[in-house]
């Protein structure tokens, strides 16, 4: 099956972060070169990298166009210099990908802290409300645009002289928690869907602490 | 299925130490949180600390606060409540619990629990 | 730490009874407070979260409320499964605190 010198891709995975989305492969081509072609469950199959010796192809355009649809890609592989031949069956050799939900499976970026405000015993943390490339109306939708209430976000805070890690959580991208008076805290938050079930959580935003200059400090 | 096994309870005398394990299975540990809560006999529910396996970060209740450590094993699936310098007053049955993580939920699963008894 | 104080301690009453427990915390907590069910030997089950909706699986029967700071957990006709102890518990701050727990009896 297929042209002598053609090998059919394989381990085809899907890299995906707040979005943006990239189908990976193997093998390094020797001597063919490949194109990708991608659908929903429902619909046509559209042609994307062609004939290229990546192993590699960036779908996100694709796939930000509903982010809700399941998709699925698949990579054809050509004699480099003979993209017209086929395979003993009449068609270039192909491998499917996995089916890829992207509103359930892309991973979640890693948040940032913006800022944070302390006002006597309160402090009050905002988390960066990360831009995506999904778009509507010709703007790009921020993270809490597209995921609404089903993103939440973990803080974790501690005084800086001790290790326990107290936790907050918000549907927002605000957090106001009780402090003691005259102690300093460093604060981390990550990005939370409770509602999956894989990929729930991002990794932690760098860790913020006060009396750097993200915070400002208000006696009251 | 989602299921937490508890095991390593046992008879102990004040002053020693002894490790518990929760097993999970059915989810994987890194995308929740694990709590430890300790019910003495005849008592109720105390709260006793949790961990977020994905990062490590651990908070433990005041109680046992340089006495007790919670760790997890990704690999293992599992979470780990060790405990030193043991005394009678921490003598009960001892359940770890998955936390949901959500606004809404927190321990919606439980295991079966596991007796440390403290005494000499 | 916040307290969550729960009562009664313990109740009586019959099967068919309309029974309501209530758990009152120290400070706000928002709607963050569920409901547990134990029975003897048991661990705890999640009954009721975010103060007011019925966990997957628990009959109608069990309902939760909230008015500022207090809670309130009924069981509008008590049913012969449902004589256990009940727990409140709030996870709006760390450390999550519950109630001290109350036993319903058979009268």
């Known amino acids: 099956s297929g042209t002598t010198n053609t090998v059919a891709a394989y381990n085809l995975t899907w890299k995906s972060t707040n979005f943006k989305t990239i189908l990976e492969w193997e093998p390094k081509p020797v001597n063919q070169v490949y194109t990708v072609q991608i659908s929903t469950k429902s619909g046509d199959w559209k042609s994307k990298c062609f004939y290229t010796t990546d192993t590699e192809c960036d779908l996100t355009d694709e796939i930000v166009k509903d982010v809700k649809q399941t998709y699925l890609a698949r990579v054809f592989s050509y004699p480099a210099g003979n993209v017209e031949s086929t395979g003993s069956a009449g068609e270039p050799l192909y491998e499917n990908s996995p089916e890829f939900t992207p509103y359930l499976e892309t991973n979640l970026g890693q948040p940032t802290i913006q800022s944070f405000e302390q006002v006597g015993t309160k402090v009050n943390v905002t988390v960066e409300d990360e831009r995506t490339l999904v778009r509507r109306n010709n703007t790009f939708l921020s993270l809490r645009d597209v995921f609404g209430k089903d993103l939440i976000y973990t803080l974790y805070y501690w005084k800086s002289s001790s290790s326990g890690k107290k936790t907050a959580k918000t549907n927002t991208n605000e957090f106001l928690i009780d402090v003691d008076k005259g102690e300093n805290y460093c604060f981390s938050v990550q990005a939370v869907i409770p509602s999956r079930t894989v990929n729930r959580k991002s990794t932690d935003s760098p860790v913020e602490c006060m009396g750097q200059e993200k915070g400002e400090f208000r006696e009251i | 299925e989602v299921q937490l096994v508890e095991s390593g309870g046992g008879l102990v005398q004040p002053g020693g130490s002894l490790r518990l394990s929760c097993a999970a299975s059915?989810?994987?540990?890194?995308?929740?949180?694990i709590h430890w809560v300790r019910q003495a006999p005849g008592k109720g529910l105390e709260w006793v600390g949790f961990?977020?396996?994905?990062?490590?970060?651990?908070y433990h209740a005041d109680s046992v606060e340089g006495r007790f450590t919670i760790s997890a094993d990704t690999s293992k699936n599992t979470a780990y409540l060790q405990m030193n310098s043991l005394r009678a007053e921490d003598t009960a049955v001892y359940y770890c619990?998955?936390?949901?993580?959500?606004?809404?939920?927190?321990?919606?699963?439980w295991g079966q629990g596991t007796l440390v008894t403290v005494s000499s | 730490d916040i307290q969550m104080t729960q009562s009664p301690s313990s109740l009586s009453a019959s099967v068919g009874d309309r029974v309501t427990i209530t758990c009152r915390a120290s400070q706000d907590v928002n709607t963050a407070v569920a409901w547990y069910q134990q029975k003897p030997g048991k661990a705890p089950k999640l009954l009721i979260y975010s103060a007011s909706f019925l966990y997957s699986g628990v009959p109608s029967r069990f309902s939760g409320s909230r008015s500022g700071t207090d809670f309130t957990l009924t069981i509008s006709s008590l049913q012969p499964e449902d004589f256990a102890t009940y727990y409140c518990q709030q996870h709006y701050t760390t450390p999550p605190t519950f109630g001290q727990g109350t036993k319903v009896e058979i009268k």
């Open positions: 961990i977020d396996p994905y990062n490590g970060y651990t």
């Open positions: 619990a998955r936390d949901y993580g959500s606004l809404q939920v927190q321990l919606d699963y």
């Open positions: 059915g989810f994987t540990i890194s995308d929740y949180w």
